[in-house]
Interface confidence: low
């Protein structure tokens, strides 16, 4: 053999009970001593220090801590050290050493020793990772290292939880002994947090020690709180709120059409939306995620605003009894009523469209003119105003005439035309035509679609002579002979004696 | 006006403890991290870490640590830089030099320094 | 940690006159996250503390005169000054603040 010794390097025994640390020893076969005897030392291998003595087999002198707490289990002559410890209290706890005295100069401390722990709580084994949905073992670990008094095990709190399962004592690997209880269960993400128990009780004692461990019980992301569908008015300020319920803590992101708004590692998030405007209206989503899953809810921004200035299109200018077709259209949050005037007639009305067609089958004259299309919600109002231009050929009023005055005759031609037309007058008796570019003789004056030429004839003629006016433009032409009406019908002030 | 003002000039001998002192004005101290840069004479700029205002939390860079200590007195807007067993090698200007906190911490900001200390001159000579 | 190459380590150029000085990362110092370039440039005039010229490779910092000129991505980087004033002279350190803080050697500016 050689110098050696063999002990657990820890044990562990609860307080008030006994603790037995296994113990052998060796050494050189030649050595023949003819006594073995030993010591076990407190917290110092070296004797020089006058370390605290535990047992010493050569006298029954020990330090006051051990006085009548100690034995030796082992028979030295046979190499075994065993060492018990009774009523043991927290002071005991620390680092014991044996040292072999086999007389003479052989003398040995071995540097192998035991470090006694005095616990007064059960262990209770959770697995690193605790996942919800994913089965479970806990176990409750105790010390079972005295012969006098043996642990027995419980769970406290574990309803709900399974049976538990004891699997009586163990060995471990240094010699000492534990007992243990299993529970085998499938968390919940409720179960996070919950405070398990485990309580070891020793029969025909009061001794009674409880352990308990929190569950860190990892789970995915639920998304608990969220806007429900938002509505705010351009230039608002909007707030959204996305709160996860999740472990570890989730990366909690606001996504608008795959683009990051704001992220961080929360359980909830803000995201704060300063003076809104249409072009943030939309779907907003938030994205709640850790390593056990993700979970991801919307919330939709409806952005109120007042109607843009409507646009129009179609076609501005028609020759009559064409079909007219025109589009007002706008953009507005509510969708607005649309509605289209002329002259504060209205045409076609439409709710909560942000179209309005206006069909006009067969223009005629009467159509033409201004036209407002007016937009309104209850954020606002808008218009835009524009005009239809319907073309026609010249048509010849009833107020067209001739009248005679001393030595003047008046001659009023009045066609309504779109385009202007352009306007003759016949003298058929003189085989004469005189036409609106001659100023000498006629005066043209046009006030909107209505063109009023005059033809004035100066001399005196013994009858009143045929006048015939012609307009014409590119859709055809008309001819009418001016019928003459007595002085009293003229329009103009006759001027003279 | 943002300063930070840095206390005066030490000569020390090796082995004693150095405090050097940088108080800030003009702006939030909590809103702003304060570092600590060592520029040894005629040497370049050499970072030694930096303390959160706003939590108390130190960073030491990887030459910086043992004897260099950063703390706070934030009620008077002041950071301190403590240099224990002073070394001839300690001789050198210590500067202060805010940095923006970014308390998300997702979108990475950096810490860019914006505003520095006018320097504090330790000599350390037996 | 990242090392900072500056170079030249020290240049003379006259009054009015333009400067470019060098900075090399050992490593990318652009961050693929948010496409920045965690570089800055700093200005120390003699016997002052540094004064922040330039930060995120090329944006200047309020009140820092446009001939300053930051430029360069992932370990390449330029500092440029167009038009050289006496008041330039300085030593000019650049410094990386995406890992651990380092700053670069330096480039001695000095007027002829």
């Known amino acids: 053999g050689h110098w050696g010794a063999w002990m657990p390097s820890s044990i562990s025994a609860f307080e008030g009970t006994c603790v037995s640390i296994p113990c052998r020893f060796d050494f050189p076969d030649e050595l023949r001593p003819a006594v073995v005897h030993g010591v076990w030392y407190f917290n110092s291998p070296y004797p020089k220090n006058y370390p605290p003595v535990v047992f010493k087999s050569r006298t029954q002198v020990v330090h006051e801590s051990f006085q009548g707490r100690s034995r030796l289990l082992g028979d030295l002559g046979l190499r075994n050290c065993t060492l018990l410890l009774s009523n043991v209290s927290p002071e005991l706890g620390g680092k014991y050493y044996f040292r072999g005295d086999l007389g003479g100069y052989n003398q040995y401390t071995f540097s192998e020793h035991s470090v006694l722990d005095i616990v007064n709580t059960p262990n209770i084994v959770v697995p690193p990772e605790v996942v919800a949905g994913t089965e479970v073992e806990v176990s409750c670990m105790v010390p079972d290292n005295c012969p006098e008094l043996r642990p027995e095990l419980s769970w406290l709190g574990h309803e709900g939880l399974g049976e538990p399962a004891v699997l009586g004592r163990l060995r471990e690997d240094e010699g000492t002994w534990v007992q243990v209880s299993l529970l085998h269960f499938v968390p919940t993400r409720e179960a996070n947090g919950h405070r398990l128990g485990c309580q070891a009780s020793f029969p025909n004692t009061t001794l009674q020690f409880e352990g308990y461990a929190s569950m860190d019980v990892k789970y995915p992301p639920v998304i608990v709180e969220m806007n429900s569908s938002v509505e705010a008015i351009e230039g608002s300020h909007v707030s959204l709120l996305c709160g996860a319920d999740s472990n570890p803590p989730p990366l909690l992101t606001w996504m608008r059409d795959g683009t990051v708004l704001r992220e961080a590692v929360a359980e909830s998030l803000l995201l704060e939306l300063e003076e809104v405007t249409p072009a943030e209206d939309g779907v907003y989503a938030c994205l709640a995620e850790n390593a056990y899953g993700q979970d991801n809810r919307t919330v939709g921004l409806s952005v109120m605003y007042a109607p843009w200035k409507p646009t129009v299109n179609g076609t501005m200018v028609a020759v009559e009894g064409e079909t007219v077709s025109i589009l007002c259209s706008t953009q507005s949050n509510p969708d607005p009523i649309l509605t289209i005037f002329k002259e504060k007639q209205i045409l076609s009305t439409v709710i909560y469209e942000s179209e309005l067609q206006l069909e006009l089958p067969a223009v005629s004259p009467e159509d033409d003119g201004e036209y407002w299309c007016v937009a309104e919600n209850q954020y606002g109002q808008r218009a835009t105003a524009f005009n239809l231009s319907v073309e026609f050929a010249p048509v010849l009023l009833l107020e067209s005439h001739c009248a005679a005055a001393r030595d003047t005759v008046q001659c009023l031609c009045v066609v309504k035309s779109n385009p202007e037309p352009s306007v003759a007058f016949e003298l058929p008796s003189r085989n004469v035509t005189v036409n609106e570019s001659e100023r000498e003789f006629v005066y043209s004056e046009r006030s909107g679609l209505v063109l009023t030429s005059i033809l004035t004839l100066r001399g005196q003629a013994q009858a009143p002579p045929r006048v015939i006016c012609t307009a014409r433009n590119l859709y055809g032409a008309k001819s009418l002979e001016l019928p003459f009406q007595g002085a009293h019908r003229l329009m103009w002030a006759k001027i003279g004696p | 006006e943002i300063q930070l003002v840095q206390s005066g000039p030490e000569l020390k001998k090796p082995g004693e403890t150095n405090k050097i002192s940088c108080k800030a004005s003009?702006?939030?101290?909590?809103?702003?991290?304060m570092n600590w840069v060592k520029q040894a004479p005629g040497k370049g700029l050499k970072w030694m870490g930096w303390?959160?205002?706003?939590?108390?939390?130190?960073t030491y860079a990887d030459d910086f640590t043992g004897r260099f200590a950063f703390s706070l007195e934030t009620s008077a807007s002041t950071a301190y830089l403590q240099i224990s067993n002073l070394k001839n090698e300690d001789t050198a200007t210590y500067f202060c030099?805010?940095?923006?906190?970014?308390?998300?911490?997702?979108?990475?900001?950096?810490?860019?320094?914006?505003?520095w200390g006018q320097g504090t001159l330790v000599t350390v000579s037996s | 940690n990242i090392m900072m190459t500056q170079s030249p380590s020290s240049l003379a150029v006259s009054a009015g006159e333009k400067v470019t000085m060098s900075c090399k990362s050992s490593?990318?110092?652009?961050?693929?996250?948010?496409?920045?370039?965690?570089l800055a440039w700093y200005q120390q005039k003699p016997g002052q503390s540094p004064k922040l010229l330039i930060y995120w490779a090329s944006t200047r910092e309020s009140g820092v005169p446009d001939r300053f000129t930051g430029s360069g991505s992932g370990t390449d980087f330029t500092l440029t000054i167009i038009n050289v004033h006496t008041e330039d002279l300085a030593v000019y350190y650049c410094h990386q603040y995406l890992s651990s803080l380092t700053f670069g050697t330096g480039t001695k500016l000095e007027i002829k």
């Open positions: 030099a805010r940095n923006p906190i970014n308390y998300y911490g997702i979108n990475y900001e950096g810490y860019v320094m914006d505003y």
């Open positions: 003009g702006y939030t101290f909590t809103n702003y991290g």
């Open positions: 490593h990318s110092v652009l961050y693929s996250s948010n496409q920045k370039n965690y």
């Open positions: 303390i959160n205002t706003y939590t108390g939390e130190p």
